[in-house]
């Protein structure tokens, strides 16, 4: 708290300008009118106010708007946004994408702070869903944003928004998140032809079921090993050697280097050794010839 002291003669601020950087904290408190500050917020960011001076300016706005700042002020907060607490931000009603962009710009190049996370949460909840323009904006500032959402939150992403997602936006997504995103991507890209479809869907395939992988194997897609290694193990296990060979195309040779890692290791254990031998890669660990394979899960379902 800054003590209430009278403004020295001749120091009353008539406008928000660079001369204010020479004001002490108590002078800013005494000589800057909160209403003037609110109407000239757009000037604050153009002036190199210190951390301590920004504290005083925030205090003035808090007194003027105890119930939360109006959007006209929020949009021009600039670096003053860094002084806000999540509690402050929860009082706001931010509806404009321009306001969101302006505030994200302030923290650009830095990790997502609790303030930014709260702001995004407020904004998205206010809109009711994560529309394409919002997702475009958020992933531009924070490529990992999508993967920071829970599967429940991701369920509110409309398929049309999937067009805004870039491969790097999914780098840190786990299988549970891809399980939610994959069906949306499939829907979003359904009208594309084979090769174009594969380019778009590739990043989402960590959520694809077996039947979709089987379908892709019939389309000469030449999936790379990096994508294959991110597939769900339970989706890969039922694939035959022939289907994996078609799915990977010339990349099938990469299986040898990955034979000790999931899902390749688990898939090898499910294949007949003589089928694996047809690949000519020296993959070992398949079911020996003459052995009978019992699918116990199927047996349980029948009993």
């Amino acid at each position: 708290e800054v003590e209430k002291t009278a403004c020295p003669s001749g120091k009353k601020a008539r406008e928000i300008d660079e001369s204010l950087i020479f004001y002490k904290k108590w002078e800013l408190e005494a000589c800057v009118d909160a209403a003037l500050l609110a109407t000239q917020m757009d000037r604050v960011n153009a002036i190199p106010f210190t951390y301590e001076q920004l504290d005083v300016l925030k205090h003035k706005l808090d007194e003027l708007y105890p119930q939360g700042y109006p959007e006209s002020v929020i949009q021009h907060l600039g670096y003053l946004f860094l002084k806000m607490s999540p509690e402050d931000i929860r009082k706001w009603n931010v509806t404009s994408l321009e306001t969101l962009k302006a505030l994200l710009e302030v923290n650009k190049g830095h990790e997502m702070s609790p303030q930014v996370a709260t702001l995004i949460d407020r904004f998205v909840k206010g809109r009711g869903q994560l529309d394409k323009d919002t997702l475009d904006t958020l992933t531009a500032f924070y490529p990992g944003y999508l993967c920071s959402l829970s599967p429940e939150e991701l369920s509110s992403v409309p398929p049309s928004s999937i067009w805004a997602v870039r491969p790097q936006d999914l780098d840190t997504c786990d299988p549970r998140q891809l399980d939610v995103l994959y069906p949306k991507a499939r829907l979003a890209f359904q009208n594309m032809n084979g090769s174009e479809y594969f380019v778009k869907i590739q990043s989402f395939l960590g959520g694809a079921p077996t039947e979709d992988l089987k379908a892709l194997s019939q389309q000469n897609v030449s999936m790379d090993l990096a994508t294959f290694m991110k597939l769900r193990t339970d989706a890969v296990l039922p694939l035959t050697v022939a289907e994996v060979q078609k799915l990977l195309g010339p990349h099938v040779e990469g299986l040898k280097a990955e034979e000790r890692h999931r899902p390749v290791r688990d898939w090898i254990l499910r294949q007949r050794q003589d089928d694996l031998d047809t690949l000519g890669l020296g993959l070992q660990g398949g079911i020996p010839n003459g052995y009978l394979v019992l699918d116990l899960s199927m047996q349980e379902a029948l009993s």
Epitope: A46, I47, Y51, L80, V106, G109
Partner: nanobody, 114 residues
């Protein structure tokens, strides 16, 4: 954000120095910036500032002697100090934008006029 000030040293009264401040990223090209100084036992105070629009302002004590400028291509801010006086002795810091708002400072560069 890293701020690296340089160019300080020992100089005789009436002499000149040119301080430089380099920042990581594109911090100075887009933001308002300022030079500050802190004399022994004193509070840090602003000396010269440049708004994001490019207008400059100086503390009364250095007006006419100091000049702030910036080179956006090099992401560097300068402080040309002429007609130096013993009372200009201090550690000089530059700052602006995100780091200034967050209260992060560089090491500063020491100027001694004697």
């Amino acid at each position: 954000v890293q701020l690296v000030e340089s160019g300080g040293g020992l100089v005789q009264p009436g002499g000149s120095l040119r301080l430089s401040c380099a920042a990581s990223g594109s911090m100075f090209s887009i933001n308002a910036v300022a030079w500050y100084r802190q004399a022994p036992g004193e509070q840090r105070e602003p000396v010269a500032a440049m708004t994001s629009g490019g207008s400059t302002i100086y503390a009364d004590s250095v007006k006419g002697r100091f000049t702030i400028s910036r080179d956006n291509a090099k992401n560097t801010v300068y402080l040309q100090m002429n007609s130096l006086k013993p009372e200009d002795t201090a550690v000089y810091y530059c700052n602006g934008g995100w780091s200034l708002a967050m209260g992060y400072w560089g090491q500063g560069t020491s100027v001694t006029v004697s």
